[in-house]
């Protein structure tokens, strides 16, 4: 289990407890409710695909 306050993830990634691995912050526009997005520096700008249902 990931210790609080530590991150094994490279820049641009954040730890996902749900998926038990580092995940790319770039995926947060498409999956904004993912647990790891809370660990990304800022909410990245949306891209077009967010407009799809």
């Amino acid at each position: 289990e990931q210790a609080p306050g530590t991150s094994p993830c490279s820049s641009g990634s954040s730890w996902s407890a749900d998926l038990d691995k580092c995940m790319d912050c770039a995926s947060c526009p498409a999956r904004p409710h993912s647990d790891f997005c809370l660990g990304c520096a800022a909410a990245p700008p949306a891209h077009f695909r967010l407009l799809w249902p």
Epitope: D18, L19, A26, P29, R31, P45, F48
Partner: antibody, heavy 119, light 111 residues
Framework: EVKLGESGGGLVQPGGSMKLSCVAS????????MNWVRQSPEKGLEWVAE??????????HYAESAKGRFTISRDDSRSSVYLQMNNLRAEDTAIYYC??????????WGQGTSVTVSS | DIVLTQSPASLAVSLGQRATISCKAS??????????MQWYQQRPGQSPKLLIK???KLDSGVPARFSGSGSGTDFTLNIHPVEEEDTATYYC?????????FGGGTRLEIK
């Protein structure tokens, strides 16, 4: 280890139907969108359909070439995704792959199942 | 739909040298933060395999001799130094919008 096993391909006549299946293991299936992608010498790699999560009400999206003819579905209890293909045409002849994506990347690919539409 | 044009269609590179493959998109697939472009490798007789995501990030287990760069509409895959096992067809793919589309592929032969 991630495993994806496609099945259900074969030879079918134009206008016929076929249902492809893909059984997945080695990753949290319920958290991943699932895609079908096909590959033919004529058209190369071509995305066909995507199905999202239960929390997205299993939203589906299709390529124009698949709309109205193909239906993607999933069974989370079986870690499986399906592609029902109706009114098949010669141009649907291809190898069909299933692939999970968390958001943008097709992280893993199965070995594919071959579909031939010919009389 | 976004059209991805790869060049060259094929290339032959001597062992240990550099291979450079281009992918041009018909419209931008980048925000100020990220580029939504991926690269895949397909060895003969095998399924595609993810190499690079978000234009420049290597997938886990991919050797460091692979690198990706670019933003907006112009993207590049570099392999240096090339090895025998790099003989394959390489595809770019965008995830900016639906439908996802792929480039036509670049076949790499090692001399």
């Amino acid at each position: 280890e991630v495993k994806l096993g496609e099945s259900g391909g074969g030879l079918v006549q134009p206008g016929g139907s076929m249902k492809l299946s893909c059984v997945a293991s080695g990753f949290p299936f319920t958290k991943y969108w699932m895609n079908w992608v096909r590959q033919s010498p004529e058209k190369g790699l071509e995305w066909v359909a995507e199905i999202r999560l239960k929390s997205d009400n299993y939203a589906t999206h299709y390529a124009e070439s698949a709309k109205g003819r193909f239906t993607i579905s999933r069974d989370d209890s079986r870690s499986s995704v399906y592609l029902q293909m109706n009114n098949l045409r010669a141009e649907d002849t291809a190898i069909y792959y299933c692939s999970p994506t968390y958001a943008d990347t097709m992280d893993y690919w199965g070995q594919g199942t071959s579909v031939t539409v010919s009389s | 739909d976004i059209v991805l044009t790869q060049s060259p269609a094929s290339l032959a590179v001597s062992l240990g040298q550099r291979a450079t493959i281009s992918c041009k998109a018909s419209q931008s697939v980048s925000t100020s933060t990220y580029s939504y472009m991926q690269w895949y490798q397909q060895r003969p007789g095998q399924s595609p395999k993810l190499l690079i995501k978000y234009a420049s990030k290597l997938d886990s287990g991919v050797p460091a001799r692979f690198s990706g760069s670019g933003s907006g509409t112009d993207f590049t895959l570099n392999i240096h130094p090339v090895e025998e096992e790099d003989t394959a067809t390489y595809y770019c793919q965008h995830s900016w919008e639906l439908p996802y589309t792929f480039g036509g592929g670049t076949r790499l032969e090692i001399k």
